[in-house]
């Protein structure tokens, strides 16, 4: 058993049929010694008396808010949560496996630049009685500070018969140098509590590996005389690290119709303009990627050919 | 920026082309190592990230773009010594910091060159003959060092009398290649920045 936060405790249980469970001793936070009784949640049934209460925690029915009273007055609370371990593996029932970039990916993180600011998100099908708490640091043995905000519900989607909820959190490394060469990864820890179930999820990464620039901005087309070619130009996204001659991007320019199966014109360039062949009912799209360290491509920025 | 802005032109700043080749060569070598040593811990997640130049050179700090010198977090350990010879220097207006930056890059390359050559000598003794260093990568390191043209003491190649542990050598190779790739990225950024200046 360990303390998650004041008056909230996590009991770690090996979860299998007829498991013996865990013996837990609760102590009432009071100077009083006599006349103390214990109840669980809203029930008025007295579970025991005395300053301490010993319980055998085996299942979710044994978890919950234990309260000690004296003469009708509440003295203190202890909330017990369960953390299940099945076949030596901690349960991951609360969050959905996003399977990208690999299986057992529950947390996904991205950074728009090298400033030390990043966003992580996760998915769940649970809509109520759900809380998240996020901590982060650079390295684990001698951790350096990363400050994370509160996790918020950022999107709701319907997937078949199920509703899916996306939560996200923004974090900022306290003292980040965009030009630094990372040798210790960022660690992100998410505590998830659904009703009386506790789970924790972690992710470890280097900012350089989670870079995904915003799409290029201000796409413009200029038809070339006596030709089917157009010159397309664009600018670096505002959110990208500066100076751009140090933090350079490379670009992919593509002309394609509405269907992915349609024919296309595609060219890669380090410049902020390119010449392509435009077709009726097609659009020109441009995306960006760090020129020197190949992490993710940005989403496409598009303009119609016409 | 205190350096005049000019149109980027590979001919104007000879080291840019070499640094691009360097990044390409080390990336290819790392990819080859990851494929060949698939049953060894050779991915970014599996290895310890060590920097053999730590406390010996200060490339990141010495080569910091002027725009980032206002960022407190980037200024932990700025060096103040400088060296002013070097053929990549594009004009007489070149600042001392730029000379220090290029000499720091040169020292990095020299250190990695020695490590890689020592390691290759060990790998050549491996009866499995599983992996060797790409001669192209070693040549590209040499070309960039020649383009930088700094005079410095030659570092003797380390020779070891004991029987090499090939498993450890291959893991060390992965560690070295990962670190060198990161440094090659920095070098490429720096050359691109200087080329635009």
């Amino acid at each position: 058993i360990w303390e998650l936060k004041k008056d909230v405790y996590v009991v770690e249980l090996d979860w299998y049929p007829d498991a013996p469970g865990e013996m837990v001793v609760l102590t009432c936070d009071t100077p009083e010694e006599d006349g103390i009784t214990w109840t669980l949640d809203q029930s008025s049934e007295v579970l025991g008396s005395g300053k301490t209460l010993t319980i055998q925690v085996k299942e979710f029915g044994d978890a919950g808010q234990y309260t000690c009273h004296k003469g009708g007055e509440v003295l203190s609370h202890s909330l017990l949560l369960l953390h299940k371990k099945e076949d030596g593996i901690w349960s991951t029932d609360i969050l959905k496996d996003q399977k990208e970039p690999k299986n057992k990916t529950f947390l996904r993180c991205e950074a728009k630049n090298y400033s030390g600011r990043f966003t992580c998100w996760w998915l769940t099908t649970i809509s109520t009685d759900l809380t998240f708490s996020v901590k982060s640091s650079r390295g684990s043995s001698d951790p350096q500070g990363v400050t994370c905000g509160a996790a918020t519900l950022s999107a709701e989607r319907v997937r078949g018969d199920n509703k899916e909820y996306e939560y996200s959190v923004e974090c900022q490394e306290d003292s980040a140098c965009p030009a630094a060469e990372e040798s210790l990864p960022i660690e992100v820890m998410v505590d998830a509590v659904h009703k009386l179930k506790y789970e924790n999820y972690t992710s470890s990464f280097f900012i350089r590996d989670i870079i995904k620039p915003d799409p290029p901005k201000n796409l413009q087309l200029k038809p070339l005389k006596n030709s089917r070619q157009v010159e397309v130009s664009w600018e670096y996204p505002d959110t990208w690290s500066t100076p751009h001659s140090y933090f350079s991007l490379t670009f992919c320019v593509q002309v394609q119709g509405k269907s992915k199966r349609e024919k296309k014109d595609r060219v890669f360039t380090d410049k902020t303009s390119a010449t392509v062949i435009c077709r009726k009912n097609a659009s020109i799209s441009v995306r960006a990627q760090d020129r020197y360290y190949s992490s993710s491509w940005s989403e496409w920025a598009s303009v119609p050919c016409s | 920026r205190n350096l005049p802005v000019a149109t980027p032109d590979p001919g104007m700043f000879p080291c840019l082309h070499h640094s691009q080749n360097l990044l390409r060569a080390v990336s290819n070598m790392l990819q080859k190592a990851r494929q060949t040593l698939e049953f060894y811990p050779c991915t970014s997640e599996e290895i310890d990230h060590e920097d053999i130049t730590k406390d010996k050179t200060s490339t990141v700090e010495a080569c910091l773009p002027l725009e980032l010198t206002k960022n407190e977090s980037c200024l932990n350990s700025r060096e103040t010594s400088f060296i002013t010879n070097g053929s990549c220097l594009a004009s007489r207006k070149t600042s001392f910091m730029m000379a220090l930056c290029l000499s720091s890059i040169y020292e990095d390359l020299k250190m990695y060159q020695v490590e890689f050559k020592t390691m290759n000598a060990k790998l050549l003794m491996d009866p499995k003959r599983q992996i060797f260093l790409d001669q192209n990568m070693l040549a590209v390191i040499d070309e960039l060092m020649q383009a930088l043209n700094f005079n410095s003491e030659t570092v003797p190649q380390k020779s070891s009398l004991e029987e090499p542990d090939f498993y450890k050598t291959k893991i060390k190779l992965c560690i070295l290649l990962h670190a060198f790739r990161i440094r090659a990225v920095t070098i490429d950024r720096v050359m691109s920045y200087l080329n635009a200046s």
Epitope: R228, E262, K263, K264, D265, R266, V267, F268 | P10
Partner: antibody
Framework: QVQLVQSGAEVKKPGSSVKVSCKAS????????LHWVRQAPGQGLEWMGW????????EYAPKFQGRVTITADESTSTAYMELSSLRSEDTAVYYC???????????WGQGTLVTVSS | DIVMTQSPLSLPVTPGEPASISCRAS??????LHWYQQKPGQAPRLLIA???QSISGVPSRFSGSGSGTDFTLTISSLQPEDFATYYC?????????FGQGTKVEIK
């Protein structure tokens, strides 16, 4: 299986024209760009131009501009390359090639040898 | 026009040994570079697109690298069927242009 089948070898007199055909099978004809590339005996490859069979748009290499015409007939899934004012240096194998990507070629015809000789 | 220069023009290799062919562009072409193999009396065959993207059906011993002006096609271990002429082609701008070809021959 996508295939491009070209017309047979031709012998032409200098100053005359030649029209080579390229019939496509497998896949929708208008879903691909179609190019013509030639190769003189013992020499390298030389790109001549492309056509978008969907709308008849064409683009030619400056070297052949005014002398080459590329057309396409969607009803028969056939593309044509006509080269006029032939000279001896036009003796070559002419290939048609296609791709959904405009700028490179993933399927090639077997080639048509055009000999220009007096 | 962008001029593509291949080297060497002839490359004698022992079967089973690796081979590398170089292609240089007269100006920067990013990764807009493709490689083809041509055997005598046959049409060219696409091996690599955009400098390093493998093509389905092409053996994994063929790999490409490079960007900007310098590109390399590598055959990790030459098989008897790999003796052929190899061409690079730039797609950065029209007109599309090819290298003059490298003939890989049995040593």
């Amino acid at each position: 299986q996508v295939q491009l089948v070209q017309s047979g070898a031709e012998v032409k007199k200098p100053g005359s024209s030649v029209k080579v055909s390229c019939k496509a099978s497998g896949g929708t004809f208008s879903d691909y760009y179609l190019h013509w590339v030639r190769q003189a005996p013992g020499q390298g490859l030389e790109w001549m131009g492309w056509i978008d069979p969907e709308n008849g748009d064409t683009e030619y290499a400056p070297k052949f501009q005014g002398r080459v015409t590329i057309t396409a007939d969607e009803s028969t899934s056939t593309a044509y390359m006509e080269l006029s004012s032939l000279r001896s240096e036009d003796t070559a194998v002419y290939y048609c090639a296609r791709n959904k990507e405009l700028r490179y070629f993933d399927v090639w015809g077997q080639g048509t040898l055009v000999t220009v000789s007096s | 026009d962008i001029v593509m220069t291949q080297s060497p023009l002839s490359l004698p290799v022992t079967p089973g040994e690796p081979a590398s062919i170089s292609c240089r562009a007269s100006q920067s072409i990013s990764i807009n570079l493709h490689w083809y193999q041509q055997k005598p009396g046959q049409a060219p065959r696409l091996l690599i697109a955009f400098a390093s993207q493998s093509i389905s059906g092409v053996p994994s011993r063929f790999s490409g690298s490079g960007s900007g002006t310098d590109f390399t096609l590598t055959i990790s271990s030459l098989q008897p069927e790999d003796f052929a002429t190899y061409y690079c082609q730039q797609s950065n701008s029209f007109p599309l242009t090819f290298g003059q070809g490298t003939k890989v021959e049995i040593k």
